[in-house]
């Protein structure tokens, strides 16, 4: 009789996670009588996967009926494969005994598990930055196998080149993770811009996964300030306008100062958006010049998105306007009513748009 051989015809088998794997094994002889066992790995630490004679292996079934007369096919079927199942599987013939004695092992079949990467998650900087600054975006995807993977970055459809990518771990593993950091230079026009991280892997059949981040979360566009005086009104009132333009995000506080004293504070809300995603805001102040003996220094102070305040000042020349007799009041135009106060303190009422 020929000497028994244990034949594992496939050197390697690749299976998608969630699918089933068939590991083939045949023996060339009915002799010696004894069970087949399947192990993952070799040596003393090998893991028992299937024992023909005993044990409960809920995910493993024998492909052929083990009770079949003169059975020499000991192939197994492993269901619901996960990346943790990856490894080299050995079909090992034992001689019946107490205990059974190992006779011969097959050459082994390497099971690799194709696992899809998780949806890429893109995270931006913790704090906003202004135009011309460089910000970093990070893209992470996990749980894929095999290790080979391609990651690309795009900004508004244009591929980026300034990024660094790492796949971990460096050695063999059941599954891998990728982390990439891209550096993006911001421009004032980036409020509506988007960065895209695109991951391509053998398991995705040419349909890459994408993760996105909006630059609106990362950018701050500081406002331009312009303070102007509108035409003089008949009742000695000057209309001073503070135009705050091209800012993002909307979080903005505007304070009017008259000769250094706070006159009014306003918060921006529900502003219409410009085409480029920025916002404009106009605030105006009516100053009754007849109430002032000297020139009035008006300051428009803007605090944008928690940044240090930006000021723009404007002097209203009182000497240029004839003073109304008997009036010591600077009044706000609230429509039709002007109110007189008999005390010496100036009371200022203001209206804004």
């Amino acid at each position: 009789e020929e000497e028994l051989q244990v034949i594992q015809p496939e050197k390697s088998v690749s299976v998608a996670a969630g699918d089933s794997a068939t590991l083939n094994c045949t023996v060339t002889s009915l002799i010696p009588v004894g069970p087949i066992q399947w192990f993952r790995g070799a040596g003393p630490g090998r893991e028992l996967i299937y024992h023909q004679k005993e044990g409960h292996f809920p995910r493993v079934t024998s492909v052929s009926e083990s009770t079949k007369r003169n059975n020499m096919d000991f192939s197994i079927h492993i269901s619901n494969i996960t990346p943790a199942d990856a490894g080299t599987y050995y079909c090992v013939k034992f001689r019946k005994g107490s205990p059974d004695v190992e006779v011969k092992s097959g050459a082994g079949t390497e099971l690799s598990v194709r696992a899809k990467p998780s949806a890429p998650v893109v995270s931006g900087p913790a704090v906003r930055a202004t135009a011309e600054h460089t910000v970093s975006f990070t893209c992470e995807s996990h749980g894929f196998s095999p290790r080979d993977i391609t990651l690309k970055w795009f900004k508004n459809g244009n591929e980026l080149s300034d990024f660094q990518t790492n796949v971990d771990p460096a050695g063999k593993s059941v599954s891998y993770s990728i982390r990439s950091t891209a550096r993006v230079v911001l421009t004032r026009r980036d409020v509506h811009s988007q960065v895209i991280c695109e991951v391509a892997h053998v398991t995705l059949q040419g349909d890459p996964l994408r993760g996105t981040a909006n630059l609106s979360e990362a950018i701050r566009v500081p406002p331009f300030l312009e303070v102007t005086q509108q035409s003089m009104r008949a009742d000695n009132q000057v209309n001073v306008t503070c135009q705050v333009t091209k800012f993002y995000p909307q979080r903005l506080q505007l304070t009017w100062l008259e000769n250094g004293n706070v006159s009014r504070t306003e918060m921006a809300s529900a502003l219409p958006e410009n085409k480029d995603g920025t916002y404009n805001w106009t605030s105006w102040l009516l100053v009754n010049v007849s109430a002032h003996r000297d020139d009035v220094k008006l300051t428009c102070q803007v605090e944008h998105d928690g940044q240090p305040a930006v000021n723009k000042s404007f002097s209203v020349k009182v000497s240029a306007h004839p003073k109304e007799q008997g009036s010591n009041t600077a009044a706000e135009n609230t429509g039709t009513n002007e109110r007189d106060y008999k005390d010496d303190d100036d009371k200022h009422h203001h209206h804004h748009h």
């Epitope: 009789e1 009915l30 002799i31 009588v33 004894g34 024992h51 023909q52 004679k53 005993e54 044990g55 009926e65 083990s66 009770t67 079949k68 007369r69 003169n70 059975n71 019946k96």
Partner: antibody
Framework: QVQLVQSGAEVKKPGASVKVSCKAS????????INWVRQAPGQGLEWIAM????????HYNQIFKDRATLTTDTSTSTAYMELRSLRSDDTAVYYC????????????WGRGTLVTVSS | DIVLTQSPDSLAVSLGERATINCRAS??????????IFWYQQKPGQPPKLLIY???NLDSGVPDRFSGSGSGTDFTLTISSLQAEDVAVYYC????????FGQGTKLEIK
């Protein structure tokens, strides 16, 4: 290790039936055939039948085909052999035996159940 | 059905001597290069014990003084040096198709 534990001795009247049990342990019950063999006092071995517990496939010796029925209960890893219409010449020790190599041989045996048929 | 005939029916051999038991099949029990003959030993009050499978292969734990040979229709069980504990009845069995046993050979010490 493999063990086959059989039910106790039975005394039956002619024409009655007997059901002998064989509880298996130490191996996966559904992976190996169970054979039934009998031995009349002072006589040789006589093969009765065999059953595959995984799917209840059976093969019978023609002599016993009409009187013997083999069954299994996989939940308790127990095989049964029922013999009907007993006659005095059915008096024998009835053995169950496990076929380890799927060669239709008998590798491990129970200790036997004596069935006495007497009026 | 294949009929197995053992010879002799009984045999007395001196301790340390060779004992030979024959088994003849009514037709060939060979298939696919294997000879489907098995040998069992049965001591009084005990179930049979498998000694040899597929004509010539010693079962686990069986002393190597036992050996089997033969092919086709003629097979032999040999005990090279008889020991006192070898006193028993020996049966051959085939499984070329459904199993049958030989009638048995009683081995005693001379």
């Amino acid at each position: 290790q493999v063990q086959l534990v059989q039910s106790g001795a039975e005394v039956k009247k002619p024409g009655a039936s007997v059901k002998v049990s064989c509880k298996a342990s130490g191996y996966t019950f559904t992976n190996y055939w169970i054979n039934w063999v009998r031995q009349a006092p002072g006589q040789g071995l006589e093969w009765i039948a065999m059953i595959d517990p995984s799917d209840s496939e059976t093969h019978y010796n023609q002599i016993f085909k009409d009187r013997a029925t083999l069954t299994t209960d996989t939940s308790t890893s127990t095989a049964y052999m029922e013999l009907r219409s007993l006659r005095s010449d059915d008096t024998a020790v009835y053995y169950c035996a496990m076929d380890y190599g799927s060669l239709y041989a008998m590798d491990y045996w129970g200790r036997g159940t004596l069935v006495t048929v007497s009026s | 059905d294949i009929v197995l005939t053992q010879s002799p029916d009984s045999l007395a051999v001196s301790l340390g001597e060779r004992a030979t038991i024959n088994c003849r099949a009514s037709k060939s029990v060979s298939s696919s290069g294997y000879n489907y003959i098995f040998w069992y030993q049965q001591k009084p009050g005990q179930p049979p014990k498998l000694l040899i499978y597929l004509a010539s292969n010693l079962d686990s734990g069986v002393p190597d003084r036992f050996s089997g040979s033969g092919s086709g229709t003629d097979f032999t069980l040999t005990i090279s040096s008889l020991q006192a504990e070898d006193v028993a009845v020996y049966y051959c069995q085939h499984s070329r198709d459904l199993p049958t046993f030989g009638q048995g050979t009683k081995l005693e010490i001379k």
